[in-house]
């Protein structure tokens, strides 16, 4: 067993060694969204570029119909940034009358869908109040964390208002995941 | 071929096994920038601490002249946080007259330079409008994502205004990359 | 030495191959904090959920008494998001009288404690001024970076004001680390 001498035996019992370059990985970048109907109380999902420019999928990680498909069970690091932009937010007007109010907000959610489970699972949420006065505004929300996923799980990015997403540049709004 | 029994053959065909501790990695931390001339329409690059305190480079990942040098092709996770700070932003004055305007902004870009390619590639951008009234302000921009890089690529962090970066502490402003 | 043919010899000299699934990892999620005494000039540490819902610890990474315990020396990626929420910040009132002042702020610090070293080390800090007028506000601070840690090191997340942390959902406020 000479070839094992650098790989302690307690590790080999339950997990095969594997080449890093073979792991499922994806980095998706923003594209112009087509206006679509979505349910009133449900945040719409973004769709993504998966092969042009900086975008790629590899090693059986596939993108289809707004979803990243997880091809292999394991621990994944998942991340996304969404840059939002808009004009003076509504709350600034109401402020002037001196009445506090529910602020405008921007929200990003990374959601997991498991076919065998009826409800999607919210993995990550970034949410910000937006109360700007007298000028256009823009700002990103960044999210990233590690999750245990199962083969067949699907990941998507949902936003509170698809019309505020900055889809102009691939470096401003993106979504990715990789097996650790 | 006893030593291969825990490494499935389909992986070994195109990617060698390799020890994780041997992978190129760097975490760079902020240092005070010396005011220097730079081109008018180009965001200046930050320079970094690469060996004192929390900062390090290892396994052939080198830092030189504002650049991280990529020593080996592969998929890298790249990240940076820049903390900005300033005084009341200009737009707050214009607001008072009730006129919307182009807001002040802060921007961070992680840029890739490939010697064989004439134009730098913007990998990541975080950009925020800043419209503060009546007090000093401070806030971070965080970025992180995975990219396929080639041996010889160089990475840098550019900012919209080098004079607004918080240089005081190594935990506030930093830049790193590691091979996955 | 047939089993070594896919693992270049220069790597094997100083680092054993190891299975990725065996690496220490944790993702902790927010729980309601119990009001506790803390020193006046010291940011309080958050405590966390470590096994329910999305939370987990594995491969000898343990959570105890607000700390993640590092079971093995190496390079770790460490991350946290804390979502804060509050009412109109104090500075907005003072602004109305036309007097600039020190703004309210929200701060997250990821701290390393090494028993053999007297002072904790601040690894990461995210800090933002909060000057909102006329409405409730909410916003996240996200941090993440790579650090070289030693077996026995302990990690915690400190915040400037524990009463402003949004502890309502596991996807809004979280803390994690994994060995690279």
């Amino acid at each position: 067993l000479k070839g094992q001498e650098f790989a302690p035996s307690h590790q080999q019992v339950y997990a095969p060694l594997r080449a890093d370059g073979d792991k499922p990985r994806a980095h998706l970048t923003v594209v112009r969204q087509t206006p679509t109907q979505h349910f009133k109380n449900q945040f719409p999902a973004l769709h993504w570029e998966h092969e042009l420019g900086l975008a790629f999928t590899k090693n059986r990680m596939n993108y289809t119909n707004k979803f990243l498909l997880i091809p292999e069970s394991g621990d994944y690091f998942i991340y996304s940034q969404v840059t939002f932009r808009g004009m003076t937010s509504e709350c600034s007007e109401i402020r002037r009358a001196g009445r506090p109010n529910k602020p405008d907000s921007i929200t990003v959610v990374i959601t997991k869908v498991t076919d065998s489970y009826p409800e999607p699972t919210q993995l990550l949420m970034g949410t910000k109040s937006v109360c700007e006065v007298g000028s256009n505004w823009f700002q990103p929300i960044y999210l990233g964390a590690m999750f245990s996923l199962q083969e067949g799980d699907k990941l998507m990015v949902n936003v509170s208002d698809i019309s505020l997403v900055d889809y102009t540049k691939e470096d401003k709004t993106f979504f990715g995941a990789f097996l650790l | 071929l006893k030593g291969q029994e825990f490494a499935p053959s389909h992986q070994q065909v195109y990617a060698p096994l390799r020890a994780d501790g041997d992978k190129p990695r760097a975490h760079l931390t902020v240092v005070r920038q010396t005011p220097t001339q730079h081109f008018k329409n180009q965001f200046p690059a930050l320079h970094w601490e690469h060996e004192l305190g929390l900062a390090f480079t290892k396994n052939r990942m080198n830092y030189t002249n504002k650049f991280l040098l990529i020593p080996e092709s592969g998929d890298y996770f790249i990240y940076s946080q820049v903390t900005f700070r300033g005084m009341t932003s200009e737009c707050s004055e214009i607001r008072r007259a009730g006129r919307p305007n182009k807001p002040d902004s802060i921007t961070v870009v992680i840029t890739k330079v490939t010697d064989s390619y004439p134009e730098p590639t913007q990998l990541l951008m975080g950009t925020k409008s800043v419209c503060e009234v009546g007090s000093n302000w401070f806030q971070p921009i965080y970025l992180g994502a995975m990219f396929s890089l080639q041996e010889g690529d160089k990475l840098m962090v550019n900012v919209s205004d080098i004079s607004l970066v918080d240089y005081t502490k190594e935990d506030k402003t930093f830049f790193g990359a590691f091979l996955l | 030495l047939k089993g070594q043919e896919f693992a270049p010899s220069h790597q094997q000299v100083y680092a054993p191959l190891r299975a990725d699934g065996d690496k220490p990892r944790a993702h902790l999620t927010v729980v309601r904090q119990t009001p506790t005494q803390h020193f006046k000039n010291q940011f309080p540490a958050l405590h966390w959920e470590h096994e329910l819902g999305l939370a987990f610890t594995k491969n000898r990474m343990n959570y105890t008494n607000k700390f993640l315990l590092i079971p093995e020396s190496g390079d770790y990626f460490i991350y946290s998001q804390v979502t804060f929420r509050g009412m109109t910040s104090e500075c907005s009132e003072i602004r109305r009288a036309g007097r600039p002042n020190k703004p309210d702020s929200i701060t997250v610090v990821i701290t390393k404690v090494t028993d053999s070293y007297p002072e904790p080390t601040q690894l990461l800090m995210g800090t933002k001024s909060v000057c909102e007028v006329g409405s409730n506000w909410f916003q996240p601070i996200y941090l993440g970076a790579m650090f070289s840690l030693q077996e026995g090191d302990k990690l915690m997340v400190n915040v400037s004001d524990i009463s402003l942390v949004d502890y309502t959902k596991e996807d809004k406020t979280f803390f994690g680390a994994f060995l690279l």
């Epitope: - | 240092v31 005070r32 920038q33 010396t34 005011p35 220097t36 001339q37 730079h38 008018k40 200046p44 700070r85 300033g86 005084m87 200009e90 000093n136 205004d161 080098i162 004079s163 607004l164 970066v165 240089y167 005081t168 502490k169 | 020190k102």
Partner: antibody, heavy 117, light 108 residues
């Protein structure tokens, strides 16, 4: 609100060492860089140099060979030493907070240092 | 080093009038890294403008900075009695940081 209080000897003979100290209150010392600036009738305002909470310094090249800016063992206050003074070093010396970067938004009261034989 | 020349040396104006102060650099100042200060006799300077045009916290909007490259201007739209003082420019586009010689604004 930030306050800077400075003290030190106001009258020196040529070749002596100027020594001034500045204490900061009202803000965290570690959140800023801290500078020394002087003002003389002959040369106007002149930046001497700055320091941060870790003791890292930047100096004006024209004074670098004679200047040391340092921290107290506790970090705050910080001090200025200027060796081998001449009449040309006669000036009002100010300590100041460097904020946001390389500009000075808060100043000490100033100390007139006169070099005369 | 960059040398800053301020003109005029003295400006004699009445309250309510507009003051225009000039600061010229011996070479281009990077990123418009230029600041303006106000100083009363026997007091420390006070920061008015940084980044050529950004007002410092608490500075009234009658003070306006403009310019880029080598030519910069501080404009006081309507002089108030408390505006009579000496004004200095400072560049921070390259090291060492340098100051201009000052413009005195006096009451006519």
């Amino acid at each position: 609100q930030v306050q800077l209080h400075q003290w030190g000897a106001g009258l020196l003979k040529p070749s002596e060492t100027l020594s001034l100290t500045c204490a900061v209150s009202g803000v965290s010392f570690s959140d800023y860089h801290w500078a020394w600036i002087r003002q003389s009738p002959g040369k106007g305002l002149e930046w001497i140099g700055d320091i941060n909470h870790r003791g890292r310094t930047n100096y004006n090249p024209s004074l670098k060979s004679r200047v040391t800016i340092s921290l107290d063992t506790s970090g705050n206050p910080f001090s200025l030493k200027l060796t081998s003074v001449t009449a040309a070093d006669t000036a009002v010396y100010y300590c100041a907070r460097d904020f946001p970067n390389w500009v000075f938004d808060s100043w000490g009261q100033g100390i007139l240092v006169t070099v005369s034989s | 080093e960059i040398v800053l020349s301020q003109s005029p040396g003295t400006l004699s104006l009445s309250p309510g009038e507009r003051a225009t102060l000039s600061c010229r650099a011996s070479q281009s100042v990077s990123s418009s890294f230029l600041a303006w200060y106000q100083q009363y006799p026997g007091q420390a300077p006070r920061l008015l403008i940084y980044g050529a045009s950004r007002r410092a916290t608490g500075i009234p909007d009658r003070f306006r900075g403009s310019g880029s490259g080598t030519d910069f201007t501080l404009t006081i739209s309507r002089l108030e009695p408390e505006d009579f003082a000496v004004y200095y420019c400072q560049q921070y586009g390259s090291s060492p940081l340098t100051f201009g010689g000052g413009t005195k604004v006096e009451n006519k």
